[in-house]
């Protein structure tokens, strides 16, 4: 057991400080301290008495309270009550609160900016490859290939709006039919859900927090995957999305509207454009088989250009190639015609970091990918820390009750639909489902929002992003208006269909159950989260892509047996849990299979072996680094000073009484002090709003 303060020694009356205590509660014996205790047993006592900031922190819960790991944690108030403060304390507390709010908004701002830059980084690293995916001619005939291209491209450019805008431009220029575009849009919907899953990985440090965050993020993934699983075959068979949207587009005489308002971008763009600016047209040009675009850089160099349209004389092989009969002449040898040429004169360079480096896109992308992930991770940790210290006591109670409580009977069922509307509205405001769901993820992690409530918010976010696309479509030029509107509407009705499938009836809310299942697995084997990400967003789509290129026969030949095995396993699993008596004794459980086929334990051993080398060099330098380490190696003895692994391991292994994670403490310093690692300081007093 990690060195925890012995509460028995610390306070004469533990009842006073322990949540729901009725008499003396059992304490967790401090094994590690017992071995190296000096005669002076009072040392830790004085330390704790000096720190009222955490003297009320509950380290031991009643076991019954945490039987269900999905129960929201009690965000315990560890500060002095407002009424008990003197004027100076109240003023100090007020300014602390303001300071926290400013910090929270600041970190939130950089969090959103880092998501934007992460998207740019992905586009620099994989944008051109993504563009080339689109230039594959088989998309037209193979909806499955269209689907995986949608997934891969969106994952590579980290932006569904980029991939859908490429699709729109391809449809407008007749390189793609709406029918062929629909699976790509479905794939883009799946691909966009990777962002918040990556954000969830940043919360790997605390098992229970990670369990909730990862499940909260992957509920989006499962909703999208399940929707596609049902709706893609339905669409291929009936073309209902294509027909409905075509009827809508044809029945209304739309006039070009105004652009969808860029509400969040207005705030973030001034900062992000100082980091990097991209020429997104290059990806579209590659997708449309423009050979010249393949050698162009995505990094924008010139921001102010003067476009001059001039007519130049060009030779043509014959008069038939002339622009028009009247614009055709000869010099006696060659035939000439006049061509309109747009001459672009560069006037002013862009003002961003990479403008004068002339680095290849891959290098810039890699640099930005690393930096944006670090900033994202850092901001997320700080947001979680600040929220953790703000959302305590009455504040937490009020917020949690507001967010997670249903309307009174008989209107309880309406709550979820209101949450869908809120999710849609918020996404419309921030103009990005990735930003909204990524901001939601840490809140799920720290226990402010339940997964049951996050689910409709996420579904609403899916709707919100399509309304943005519809507005953007209405603002597009005449030739692209119809196609972009029809595709935006396909996206909209696909999400509506998905909601109708997986939300109204509580029994059908499979994504929640699946996400919780994955959350439990990932909390136990944290490497599995990365494994899941790679498998679902890269390997499966790439395999399908590869098999599709090999032809229908190969795809069916490999796909049918795989699908058959999956269905067989699912049916067997269902029978095992519902009516095992129907099955022969051997099939009533999975024990007939070798251990590696039915358990992650052997795989865990393999992964641990591979990542053993990381544990040795693992980082005591900073919490961010440690989180990365924990994610890689699921390490029990990794960087104790950052307290992100070891304490939790020991707390969760072989403990009858569940010990709360050190996140209960208000900050790292306090938790370290409590463990006897940092000299105590009486200057720190915690302040909560209520």
């Amino acid at each position: 057991m990690a060195p925890w303060p012995e509460l028995g020694d610390a306070q004469p009356n533990p009842d006073k400080y322990l949540e729901g205590a009725a008499g003396q509660q059992p304490t967790a014996p401090d094994k590690s301290k017992e071995t190296n205790k000096t005669d002076n047993t009072e040392a830790p006592v004085t330390k704790i008495e000096l720190l009222p900031s955490y003297s009320t922190a509950t380290l031991i819960d009643e076991p019954t309270e945490v039987d269900d790991p999905w129960n929201l944690p009690t965000l315990q108030d560890s500060g002095i009550k407002w009424s008990e403060r003197d004027t100076k304390g109240k003023i100090l507390c007020f300014f602390q609160g303001i300071g926290r709010l400013i910090l929270l908004l600041g970190f939130l701002y950089f969090f959103v900016c880092s998501l934007d830059i992460l998207s740019s980084a992905f586009q620099l690293v994989g944008g051109k490859m993504a563009g080339q995916f689109f230039s594959n001619s088989s998309i037209m005939s193979n909806p499955l290939l269209g689907l995986v291209i949608g997934v891969l491209v969106t994952v590579l450019v980290q932006s569904s709006s980029t991939s859908t805008s490429i699709v729109v431009s391809m449809v407008s220029s007749s390189l793609l039919t709406v029918r062929a575009a629909i699976p790509i849009i479905m794939g883009a919907n799946i691909g966009t859900s990777i962002t918040n899953t990556i954000v969830a990985l940043m919360q790997v440090g605390d098992r229970s927090e990670f369990r909730r965050a990862f499940a909260g993020a992957t509920v989006h993934d499962f909703f999208n995957w399940l929707s596609v699983l049902v709706l893609l075959p339905v669409e291929v068979a009936t073309h209902y999305l294509e027909i409905i949207t075509q009827l809508i587009v044809e029945s209304f005489h739309f006039k070009n509207g105004e652009d969808a308002p860029d509400l969040l971008k207005v705030i973030t763009k001034p900062f992000t454009k100082l980091i990097v600016q991209l020429d997104k047209k290059v990806i579209s040009q590659i997708a449309m088989n423009d050979e010249k675009a393949k050698n162009k850089s995505l990094v924008k160099i010139w921001c102010k250009t003067f476009t001059n349209k001039t007519q130049i004389n060009v030779t043509v092989p014959s008069t038939a190639n002339c622009t028009s009969p009247s614009l055709c002449w000869t010099d006696g040898i060659q035939n000439w015609t006049m061509k309109n040429v747009t001459y672009k004169e560069n006037i002013a360079k862009c003002q961003h970091i990479f403008v004068n480096f002339h680095l290849p896109d891959l290098a810039v992308g890699t640099i930005l990918l690393i930096l944006s992930l670090l900033v994202l991770c850092g901001c997320l940790i700080m947001i979680v820390k600040i929220l953790g210290s703000v959302l305590k006591g009455q504040v937490a109670t009020v917020i949690k009750k507001t967010i997670n409580t249903d309307f009174p009977f008989p209107f309880a069922w309406l709550t979820g639909y209101l949450a869908i509307l809120v999710g849609a509205g918020m996404t419309f405001i921030v103009q990005s489902s990735s930003v909204f769901t990524s901001a939601l993820t840490p809140l799920i992690g720290i226990g402010v929002i339940t997964i049951e409530r996050a689910y409709p918010l996420t579904l609403g976010s899916n709707i919100g992003t399509t309304t943005t696309a519809i507005l953007a479509a209405l603002a597009s030029p005449g030739n692209a208006l119809r196609s972009s509107l029809q595709i935006a509407l396909c996206h909209f009705f696909f999400n509506i269909s998905g909601i109708l499938l997986w939300y109204p009836i509580p029994f059908t809310r499979l994504p929640i159950r699946m996400a919780k299942g994955l959350g439990n697995i990932s909390a136990k084997y944290r490497w599995f989260a990365v494994f899941y990400l790679i498998i679902f967003f890269f390997l499966i789509p790439l395999t399908v892509f590869g098999l599709s290129l090999a032809g229908w026969r190969v795809l069916v030949g490999v796909g049918v047996p795989v699908v058959f095995i999956i269905i067989l396993v699912l049916c067997l699993r269902l029978l095992q849990s519902r009516c095992p008596r129907v099955l022969p004794k051997k099939l009533q459980n999975w024990n007939f299979l070798p251990l590696w086929m039915r358990s992650l334990k052997p795989w865990d051993a393999v992964v641990s072996k591979f990542t053993g080398c990381f544990q040795m060099r693992c980082c005591c330098c900073c919490r961010v680094c440690c989180r990365a380490c924990c994610l890689l190696c699921d390490c029990p003895k990794c960087c104790r000073c950052s307290k992100c692994c070891e304490d939790l391991e020991e707390a969760q292994e072989g403990q009858d009484v569940p010990v709360k994670a050190p996140e209960t403490f208000d900050n790292i310093t306090i938790s370290r002090e409590a463990q006897g690692e940092v000299p105590a300081s009486d200057s720190k007093t915690e302040c909560t709003a209520l």
Epitope: T319, C328, W329, T330, D331, G332, I333
Partner: antibody, heavy 120, light 107 residues
């Protein structure tokens, strides 16, 4: 200044060939197309063809195809026009001319002309 | 081949008069038309190209206009030195073709 000096008058029998030369000076020889135009006595102008001395590319009027050959000698900055299987109707003044107005077929410098008489 | 029909074939007028010569192409030639002046015993001389662009050294009393199939050369105020034969030429298609010419004389 630009000068085009043509060879002297020729008298040929029907069926024979004639080779008219045009020596140029005052400009970069390989820059401009050289055109050959003929004018029968008291008649209008008729375009025979053109040559680009830079590459030797030629273009002939379909009417003269198979009978006319244009060549250029860059060492002497001279262009030659040979017309074979002469007939009495080929009697005309043959002009060499260049177009310095790039990309057009409007010719702005002309030689003094070479009279070719075809008679038995 | 594109046929250039020039009219009139000849005209006789007084010094200072306005002279109009027309040229009609058998098909659309855009603006790829040139006008030449040929004095007796001399080589032709370029006056106008691209229908209306005067060649260097050509007096501004010579004006060209038209497009497509109908073209006009106007001598605003005829001078004694303008006595010559005027030819139109199209360079829209190979072979280049000339009009039959208009002989301008002074009464």
């Amino acid at each position: 200044q630009v000068q085009l000096v043509q060879s002297g008058a020729e008298v040929k029998k029907p069926g024979a060939s004639v080779k008219v030369s045009c020596k140029t000076s005052g400009y970069t020889f390989i820059t401009y197309n050289m055109h050959w135009v003929r004018q029968a006595p008291g008649q209008g102008l008729e375009w025979i063809g053109a040559i680009y001395p830079g590459s030797g590319d030629t273009s002939y009027n379909q009417k003269f195809k198979g009978r006319v050959t244009m060549t250029a000698d860059t060492s002497t900055s001279t262009v030659y026009m040979e017309l074979s299987s002469l007939r009495s109707e080929d009697t005309a003044v043959y002009y060499c001319s260049i177009s310095t107005i790039i990309t057009t077929g409007a010719v702005d410098y002309w030689g003094q002309g070479t009279l070719v008489t075809v008679s038995s | 081949d594109i046929v250039m029909t020039q009219s009139p074939s000849s005209l006789s007028t007084s010094v200072g008069d306005r002279v109009t010569i027309t040229c009609k192409a058998s098909q659309d030639v855009g603006t790829a038309v040139a006008w030449y002046q040929q004095k007796p015993g001399q080589s032709p001389k370029l006056l106008i190209y691209w229908t209306s662009t005067r060649h260097t050294g050509v007096p501004d009393r010579f004006t060209g206009s038209g497009s497509g199939t109908d073209f006009t050369l106007i001598i605003r105020s005829l001078q004694p030195e303008d006595v010559a034969t005027y030819f139109c030429q199209q360079y829209s298609r190979i072979p280049l073709t000339f009009g039959s010419g208009t002989k301008v004389e002074i009464k």
